[in-house]
Amino acid sequence: MVPPPENVRMNSVNFKNILQWESPAFAKGNLTFTAQYLSYRIFQDKCMNTTLTECDFSSLSKYGDHTLRVRAEFADEHSDWVNITFCPVDDTIIGPPGMQVEVLADSLHMRFLAPKIENEYETWTMKNVYNSWTYNVQYWKNGTDEKFQITPQYDFEVLRNLEPWTTYCVQVRGFLPDRNKAGEWSEPVCEQTTHDETVPS
């Protein structure tokens, strides 16, 4: 009897949908695996007789519940199927946005770039998929614990009237208000402000 794959799960970030599993202990030799997806009531092969422990399902439609399954194989024997259900638009993890930061005197000018999507045109981003897409920005004075959050209305934001000659750190994430779903924070970007722009009288 061939044991089934273990710890079968979907790892999906920005619609890069990778079905992953672990190979069970099997004394007779090396196992291969077949992964399938349900399409119009028929299971279709996606990865056949692979020695890998993952299979790329990024070409699935973003909408709807998909039934995926994987089994282990050895010679003419095979395990039972292990099934999972996956809805990309609901289940995919929202990866961190890109961010450009520029210092202008005592202000930080930030521009945000929505995450790109696997198997899509360069310009079709997570912002196109989710109508309610917005950004959360978090910033703090470097070396302090107090963090401030803002929700920009656009793809850019300016933090004004900051303390001069002080290092501020900023990070951004995508947020979907209609789903109350937050994405992953970007890596902090830390920049030092320069002089106060006010002109002495």
Partner: nanobody, 124 residues
Framework: EVQLVESGGGLVQPGGSLRLSCAAS????????IGWFRQAPGKGLEGVSC????????HYADSVKGRFTISRDNSKNTVYLQMNSLRAEDTAVYYC????FGLGCKSEADYDYWGQGTQVTVSS
């Protein structure tokens, strides 16, 4: 049942232009995303372009960027693909597709309704 009808294909010389049209027979073409795809002889389906109804944004495959332009005329319920500077490698059957949910642009899996296609041949 929605029926998409493409027109405007034909034979054109390299460097020439064509304008393809996509209309919904007896229906409004009121879908979140309308896309154009093509299939060259012996090859798979390839995404060419799409237009989003929500913001009017347009998106293109690298291979056609700067040469093709997608647009829509809501009064005529028609989406167009203007193809300029045509090359031999643009020869294919071109399909129009409509998405009910508008979540994707390039992947055929994200589209729900398809036309029958129109042949474009670029040859001297």
């Amino acid at each position: 049942e929605v029926q998409l009808v493409e027109s405007g294909g034909g034979l054109v010389q390299p460097g020439g232009s064509l304008r393809l049209s996509c209309a919904a027979s007896g229906n409004s073409l009121d879908y979140p995303t309308i896309g154009w795809f093509r299939q060259a002889p012996g090859k798979g389906l390839e995404g060419v372009s799409c237009i989003s109804a929500s913001d009017g944004s347009t998106h293109y495959a690298d291979s056609v960027k700067g040469r093709f332009t997608i647009s829509r005329d809501n009064s005529k319920n028609t989406v167009y693909l203007q193809m300029n500077s045509l090359r031999a490698e643009d020869t294919a059957v071109y399909y129009c597709a409509a998405s009910l949910f508008g979540l994707g642009c390039k992947s055929e899996a994200d589209y729900d309704y398809w036309g029958q296609g129109t042949q474009v041949t670029v040859s001297s």
